[in-house]
């Protein structure tokens, strides 16, 4: 039997400079594309190798992006969120929520769709 799984949630402001190929990550989520049950938030689903986000090193797959340049990402359609990032300019400020899994007891299994990874 697996031990109880807890999560340590932290927030961080990440400032990225758009690189030659952009910001370098993929997102899932939105009011029309719920990735996490009962949560229409925007989550990072992929960090592109050698992209701006990967080179910065702080943004991680599974992070929830709360805002872009101070603009809240709550209640956005998926494509509207994508467009917001694409039009965010050269210097992009992301407010992100990291969700770190803290294992109590035997190691559990983290499945696809879990925002922690």
């Amino acid at each position: 039997m697996n031990g109880r799984v807890d999560y340590l949630v932290t927030e961080e402001e990440i400032n990225l400079t758009r690189g030659p190929s952009g910001l370098g990550f993929n997102i899932v989520g939105g009011t029309d594309q719920q990735y996490v049950s009962n949560d229409s938030g925007i989550y990072v689903s992929r960090i592109k190798e050698n992209g701006a986000a990967a080179l910065d090193g702080r943004l991680q797959e599974g992070d929830k992006i709360l805002s872009v340049n101070g603009q809240d990402l709550k209640n956005l359609l998926h494509q509207d969120a994508v467009d917001l990032f694409r039009n965010a300019g050269y210097a992009v400020s992301l407010r992100v929520q990291h969700r770190l899994q803290v294992q109590n007891g035997p190691i559990g299994h983290r499945g696809e769709g879990d925002p922690s990874g």
Partner: nanobody, 126 residues
């Protein structure tokens, strides 16, 4: 890890039709950006079509003849191929990535995708 399995290939006469399927593992299939590529013997891998949350994309060589679609309930993407030509002969490979890029999307760039199937052979010959 996402697994992709293609099916539906075969031998068809010029002018004929085939429907290819690509079935994917994972409960978040609806979020995947997916594409079809093809590779003929001795040739480079070539983009055919892609489907994202917001739309579809086609190579000029298949526009008006091929249609890409998906059924999220079945975790399956399709490629309906009509008016097939001998030059469509190739191994057809499906590709996927979870989510949408926040950058300019280049559907024909293989680096846009993380997961690849093994392919299904399509031969157009009389």
């Amino acid at each position: 890890e996402v697994q992709l399995v293609e099916s539906g290939g075969g031998l068809v006469q010029p002018g004929g039709s085939l429907r290819l399927s690509c079935t994917a593992s994972g409960r978040t299939f609806s979020t995947y950006t997916m594409a079809w590529f093809r590779q003929a013997p001795g040739k480079e891998r070539e983009f055919v079509a892609a489907i994202t949350w917001s739309g579809t994309y086609y190579a000029d060589s298949v526009k008006g003849r091929f249609t890409i679609s998906r059924d999220n309930a079945k975790n399956t993407m399709y490629l309906q191929m009509n008016s097939l030509k001998p030059e469509d002969t190739a191994v057809y490979i499906c590709a996927a990535v979870i989510g949408s890029t926040v950058d300019s999307y280049s559907p024909s760039d293989p680096l846009e995708y993380d997961y690849w199937g093994q392919g299904t052979q399509v031969t157009v010959s009389s």
